[in-house]
């Protein structure tokens, strides 16, 4: 949606820095948009020698870089912080690194959780 009416989406939420930033640590985030604005889900993480460290997940504001992406796929070669965004409820639950320059595709599966809705 996002064409004429306000959009509502739900995304997986996570903030590794939740204590300092005084937010929830994890759960579900309900994103309620303004008229004619799209909303996306995103994930960001670090990869230290093959160990994945989740940084943040949640709702992402209207961003053409995220349009019509069904899956959360990071394409940068070797960033300090990986980022992907997508459209679709909970599309940020799993995320992938597939560098544009080629190389192995790495998909990260989330551990099973019972998330709570953030208010």
């Amino acid at each position: 949606s996002g064409r004429g009416e306000a959009e509502t989406r739900e995304c997986i939420y996570y903030n590794a820095n939740w204590e300092l930033e005084r937010t929830n640590q994890s759960g579900l985030e309900r994103c309620e948009g303004e008229q004619d604005k799209r909303l996306h889900c995103y994930a960001s993480w670090r990869n230290s020698s093959g160990t994945i460290e989740l940084v943040k997940k949640g709702c992402w504001l209207d961003d053409f870089n995220c349009y019509d992406r069904q899956e959360c796929v990071a394409t940068e070669e070797n960033p300090q912080v990986y980022f992907c965004c997508c459209e679709g409820n909970f599309c940020n639950e799993r995320f992938t690194h597939l560098p544009e320059a080629g190389g192995p595709e790495v998909t990260y599966e989330p551990p099973p959780t019972a998330p709570t809705l953030l208010t």
């Epitope: 994103c31 995103y42 504001l61 870089n65 300090q80």
Partner: antibody
Framework: QVQLVQSGAEVKKPGASVKVSCKAS????????MAWVRQAPGQGLEWMGI????????SYAQKFQGRVTMTRDTSTSTVYMELSSLRSEDTAVYYC?????????????WGQGTTVTVSS | DIQMTQSPSSVSASVGDRVTITCRAS??????LAWYQQKPGKAPKLLIY???SLQSGVPSRFSGSGSGTDFTLTISSLQPEDFATYYC?????????FGGGTKVEIK
């Protein structure tokens, strides 16, 4: 239209406290967070902290920890920033700014600013 | 804290010129970067968020690019109302921090 209206200019003595208000209108008050940013004369912008009006939680820059208190009154859609133990270096224009609840949290609407002068 | 370094600190340009301002973060901030314009005696105004997304109502001559640590704000054809100071700001982690500002002056 969306608007943030701040309280008027203040002149304070060193050691005193100042409380600046920021009244929001034109949007759902609890659907956005509010940041405070200050600017000393001729200087750049400095982020002081953020308050989440939906729950009242706050996060302050370490530099201001212990001296700053941000509060909100949902009945009047107003946020407050109180700075204590004022010194001359606190002379600045203080801005409130509306912050999206969603990443990457831009500050999309700003108040007109409140000039605080600290002088003996 | 994440340091944000802007360059140049000032630039002299003429109406119609293309102006480019750069901002470098001391560590990776992905796309958590915004650009603001400030005119003397006025509050800052949001131009760009998420490194490259244009805020509603901002003219399309403003554009942003970059990710990670290096970012750019470009004004494709400078207009008289664009003479101001521009700041970058990261919102990746608290405390949020600003660059030192770039003053765009009339040549």
């Amino acid at each position: 239209q969306v608007q943030l209206v701040q309280s008027g200019a203040e002149v304070k003595k060193p050691g005193a406290s100042v409380k600046v208000s920021c009244k929001a209108s034109g949007y759902t008050f609890t659907s956005y967070n509010m940041a405070w940013v200050r600017q000393a004369p001729g200087q750049g912008l400095e982020w002081m902290g953020i308050i989440r009006p939906s729950v009242g939680s706050t996060s302050y820059a370490q530099k201001f920890q212990g001296r700053v208190t941000m509060t909100r009154d949902t009945s009047t859609s107003t946020v407050y920033m109180e700075l204590s133990s004022l010194r001359s270096e606190d002379t600045a224009v203080y801005y409130c700014a509306r912050v999206s609840m969603y990443a990457p949290e831009p500050m999309d609407v700003w108040g007109q600013g409140t000039t605080v002068t600290v002088s003996s | 804290d994440i340091q944000m370094t802007q360059s140049p600190s000032s630039v002299s340009a003429s109406v119609g010129d293309r102006v480019t301002i750069t901002c470098r973060a001391s560590q990776g901030i992905s796309r958590w970067l915004a650009w603001y314009q400030q005119k003397p005696g006025k509050a800052p105004k949001l131009l760009i968020y998420a490194a490259s997304s244009l805020q509603s109502g901002v003219p399309s001559r403003f554009s942003g690019s970059g990710s990670g640590t290096d970012f750019t704000l470009t004004i494709s054809s400078l207009q008289p109302e664009d003479f101001a100071t521009y700041y970058c700001q990261q919102a990746f982690s608290h405390p949020w921090t600003f660059g030192g500002g770039t003053k765009v002056e009339i040549k």
